[in-house]
């Protein structure tokens, strides 16, 4: 009988055999059968002067029971035997169909052999302790999308076929998931010229963040700011009022970059500038301001006495000139008002430009001379509407000099004494509050002639 049957080489479809024999025989009979149930027995003969052969056209990944008999004059010897499995082939054509931040989709070529499943393994090469993700797929499948991966990580993907609980050799490819962009972008504290951009840092390890912004409808005009990986907010300035802006954030690492995360916002209306009081009367205040840059519908003026009281509101059209002027009427005399002027466009309103301005004290009413004598004049008047501190009563002397008398605010009459007979006197009565003075009430009167 043959001795020392050796399997010298195995491939996916062939098995090389060699054996020893001390004596010359007519031929050898090679019999091979798959070990699985229902396997078909096959055989072929080898000339007696050969001690090796190749079994061909085997099925990949199948275990065979092989026997070699020596035949001499039509008699079969006891066989030598061996068990050997053909190799499973490695898959081919593994390609990346899509690579995203947390998913990778792969595809590969079909295999025209019998096997049970594909096995695909994803291994994070940056985090060895993370473990592998293994997925089994039924045979007709030739693509797979793995989700739940970490952004910006290097993954090794290996593809095998499995037959009879045996995993074939793997076809390996390496890829890196895309960097994720900063998330949850918010635009806060938007004014007419500034905005604060905030975001959550990406999950991927990155070198830095690129923030780009510009007017939405002007794609070419963009400003780019390079930020460190630790930053999570940035304040943009020098923006145009009432303009829609687009801001985008990109994560960067080396030559990798994430998809942009985008947000749009519209700057506020700019407030009127250089608001000033032009003039005032006892019941009106005239205001003027420089118009803002934004195209607006009108200006809204809100005003109220600073000491408290109802507030009023009036809308005035924007002037075609560089400034707009308006007069608030029906105001209380001697009253300081807090005034705010804001720009209005549809449902938007700018921050107000503010100013405090006071109406003048109103003039004491109905100043008259009720009685004349040789050396005195009796004066009467009615109290002004404004709250005030005191009166100043001035009268001229025949010499051209003026004498003033300070009177308490509850006074409504006063006798000028020590005058000269038969002289004309000019009398001026003014209400005062702090440094503010009303326009004077005036009266002319003459003392009686001496007899």
């Amino acid at each position: 009988p043959p001795k020392d049957l050796v399997v010298t080489e195995v491939t996916e479809e062939t098995v090389n055999l060699a054996w020893d024999n001390e004596m010359r025989v007519t031929e050898y009979l090679v019999v091979y059968t798959p070990t699985h149930e229902g396997g078909l027995e096959m055989q072929f003969r080898v000339p007696g002067d050969q001690t090796s052969t190749i079994i061909q056209e085997l099925e990949p990944g199948v275990e065979y029971f092989i026997r070699v008999f020596a035949i001499l004059e039509n008699k079969k010897s006891i066989p030598v035997s061996a068990r050997v499995a053909t190799y499973l082939p490695a898959p081919e054509g593994l390609k990346f169909k899509s690579i995203k931040e947390t998913s990778v989709e792969v595809e590969w070529d079909p295999l025209d052999i019998a096997f049970e499943t594909w096995e695909i393994i994803f291994r994070n090469m940056n985090k060895e302790d993370e473990g592998e993700i293994t997925k089994s797929l039924r045979r007709p499948e030739t693509s797979y999308r793995q989700t739940g991966l970490a952004p910006g990580q290097e993954y090794e993907i290996s593809l095998h076929i499995v037959k009879n609980n045996t995993r074939g050799p793997g076809l390996k490819r390496v890829t890196t998931t895309r960097l994720d962009a900063p998330s949850q972008i918010e635009v806060k504290d938007v004014t007419d010229t500034t905005a604060l951009i905030t975001w959550f840092k990406p999950l991927a390890e990155i070198d830095g963040i690129e923030l780009t912004y510009g007017i939405k409808d002007v794609p070419g005009d963009r400003t780019t700011i390079d930020l460190t990986e630790d930053e999570n907010q940035y304040s943009i300035g020098n923006l145009k009022p009432d303009t829609e802006y687009e801001v985008s954030l990109i994560s960067r690492r080396g030559d990798m970059s994430s998809n942009p995360a985008k947000e749009t916002f519209t700057t506020g209306l700019d407030a009127p500038r250089n608001l000033r009081r032009v003039s005032q009367t006892d019941n009106s205040i005239t205001l003027e301001w420089r118009n803002g840059k934004a195209a607006i519908d009108s200006y809204r003026i809100k005003y109220a006495p600073i000491s408290g009281g109802d507030h009023a509101e009036v809308d005035v059209p924007k002037s075609q000139q560089a400034t707009t002027k308006t007069t608030l009427t029906g105001l209380r005399p001697g009253t300081e008002y807090g005034i705010g002027v804001s720009a209005v466009k549809e449902d938007k309103e700018s921050n107000p430009a503010t100013i405090n301005a006071a109406t003048e004290l109103d003039t004491p009413k109905d100043l008259q001379v009720s009685e004349t004598a040789e050396t005195s004049l009796t004066l009467l008047w009615k109290t002004p509407l404004a709250k005030f501190d005191r009166y100043r009563l001035n009268y001229s002397l025949p010499t051209g000099q003026w004498v003033g008398v300070q009177l308490p605010r509850n006074t409504t009459s006063y006798v000028l004494r020590g005058l000269e007979p038969g002289q004309e006197y000019n009398v001026l009565l003014t209400a005062e509050k702090g440094r503010h003075k009303s326009k004077p009430a005036r009266v002319k009167a003459s003392t009686e002639q001496a007899p």
């Epitope: 051209g400 000099q401 003026w402 004498v403 003033g404 440094r435 003075k437």
Partner: nanobody
Framework: QVQLVETGGGLAQAGGSLRLSCAAS????????MGWFRQAPGKEREFVAA????????YYDYTVQGRFTISKDNAKNTVNLQMNSLKPEDTAVYYC????????FGDGYEMDYWGDGTQVTVSS
Amino acid sequence: QVQLVETGGGLAQAGGSLRLSCAASGRTLSGYAMGWFRQAPGKEREFVAAISWSGRNTYYDYTVQGRFTISKDNAKNTVNLQMNSLKPEDTAVYYCAVSRSLDEFGDGYEMDYWGDGTQVTVSS
């Protein structure tokens, strides 16, 4: 800097007279108005009288008009307050004050310079 020094204060009988003077030194007060305020114990400071730089225009509180006369001597940079027919309610510390305009005299908030004061006491 301007120093204002008041003199002439003291004790007087009701119906009597006193003459206060205020001398300004340190710089010329050309164009300034000068005047007097007073403060009685426990009361607010109040205006008494003032005179324009030219001396042509005067201003008095109604409580003193006809009794007090204000005058000034520009050559000496002084202002005087002649107080006649004194009453016990005239008892106070009298302060000299200087401002750019006669109009500023009234509430006393806008004075440029103040003296340290001189006591006037009127007994009944």
